[in-house]
Interface confidence: medium
């Protein structure tokens, strides 16, 4: 089987504030199986902003249909975004277990907010 | 004005060892991810390396890894490419390419730098 | 990895005259899409990115549309300095990056 990869195409976008910012990840393969999650930053500090098994999340919504079996594309948007918005953020792929555990990551998005056009 | 200089290229044998240079210049070098690409004499154009702005992450092409590495010096504003174990298909022009900020296209590149690799 | 191919492989035509350059994916590549010309003796200079948009300096007679997987670079009326091979890059794809295998745009 092939081996998984995190595609995080875009190195960082730029959102005016209140506006909505789409963040693109797309998997390469469905194993192994288990959810996508994205975080804004890294390390012990990271915020979890979407979990595909969880919520709800009222600001993030998925671009496609992530409860169809053969989804591949977990791009998020994330609406009416404010400046504690900005970071980087990864999309990150869990692999199923009691806990659920940290397989693989993108390489990151860097999401800078611009003021709110006047 | 970006400029990029490529240099260290020449005529090697197989099996031989070389190592590529590029001087940048006309942007910020350190925060800018780089890649090296070629050109073999007739063909077309082959994504071979890139390394990040701090240099923590590199990538390869499966045709080279494990012979080359790419790497930088920033307080030079320099990246390089050592290349071991040298093939008769490595022969090709050698460029160094800056990545867009935003996306991974490539948005300068140097004029190149002649590898041929003859026994 | 994603696969490019372009056609033709060369274009014979004359000044004055309209190109058209197809480049297509073997899997979606959304509008991550760059075209490149380039020219012996000469850095390889970037067109188009994002399939449609010009990159700094380039005149408009050159256009690229298209989105997912095909993709067509337009040079509505050749002048001399055209003349030159032309590539598509891919860059949805994480590394390795890949290129088209080129379309050389020759006089006729």
């Known amino acids: 089987e092939e081996e998984l990869q995190i595609i995080q195409p875009d190195k960082s976008v730029s959102v005016a504030a209140g506006e909505s910012a789409i963040l693109h990840c797309t998997i390469t393969s469905l194993f192994p199986v288990g959810p996508i999650q994205w975080f804004r930053g890294a390390g012990p500090a990271r915020v979890l902003i979407y979990n595909q098994r969880q919520g709800p999340f009222p600001r993030v919504t998925t671009v496609s249909e992530t409860t169809k079996r053969e989804n591949m594309d977990f791009s998020i948007s994330i609406s009416n975004i404010t400046p504690a918005d900005a970071g980087t953020y990864y999309c990150i792929k869990f692999r199923k277990g009691s806990p659920d555990t940290e397989f693989k990551s993108g390489a990151g998005t860097e999401l800078s907010v611009r003021a709110k056009p006047s | 004005d970006v400029q990029l200089v490529e240099s260290g290229g020449g005529v090697v044998r197989p099996g031989e060892s070389l190592r590529l240079s590029c001087a940048a210049s006309?942007?910020?070098?350190?925060?800018?991810?780089m890649n090296w690409v070629r050109q073999a004499p007739g063909e077309g154009l082959e994504w071979v390396s890139l390394i990040s702005g701090s240099g923590e992450i590199t990538y390869y092409a499966d045709s080279v890894k494990g012979r080359f590495t790419i790497s930088r010096d920033n307080s030079k504003n320099t990246l390089y490419l050592q290349m071991n174990s040298l093939r008769a298909e490595d022969t090709a022009v050698y460029y160094c390419?800056?990545?867009?900020?935003?996306?991974?296209?490539?948005?300068?590149w140097g004029l190149g730098t002649l590898v041929t690799v003859s026994s | 990895e994603t696969v490019l191919t372009q056609s033709p492989g060369i274009l014979s035509l004359s000044p004055g005259e309209r190109a058209t350059l197809t480049c297509r994916a073997s899997q979606s590549v959304y509008t991550y899409l760059a075209w490149y010309q380039e020219k012996p003796g000469q850095a390889p200079r970037l067109l188009i990115y994002g399939a449609s948009s010009r990159a700094a300096g380039i005149p408009d007679r050159f256009s690229g549309s298209g989105s997912g997987t095909e993709f067509t670079l337009t040079i509505s009326s050749l002048q001399s300095e055209d003349f030159a091979v032309y590539y598509c890059?891919?860059?949805?794809?994480?590394?390795?990056?890949?290129f088209g295998g080129g379309t050389k745009v020759e006089i006729k």
């Open positions: 890059q891919q860059y949805y794809d994480r590394p390795p990056l890949t």
């Open positions: 006309g942007f910020t070098f350190s925060t800018s991810d």
């Open positions: 390419a800056k990545e867009n900020d935003r996306y991974r296209f490539f948005d300068y």
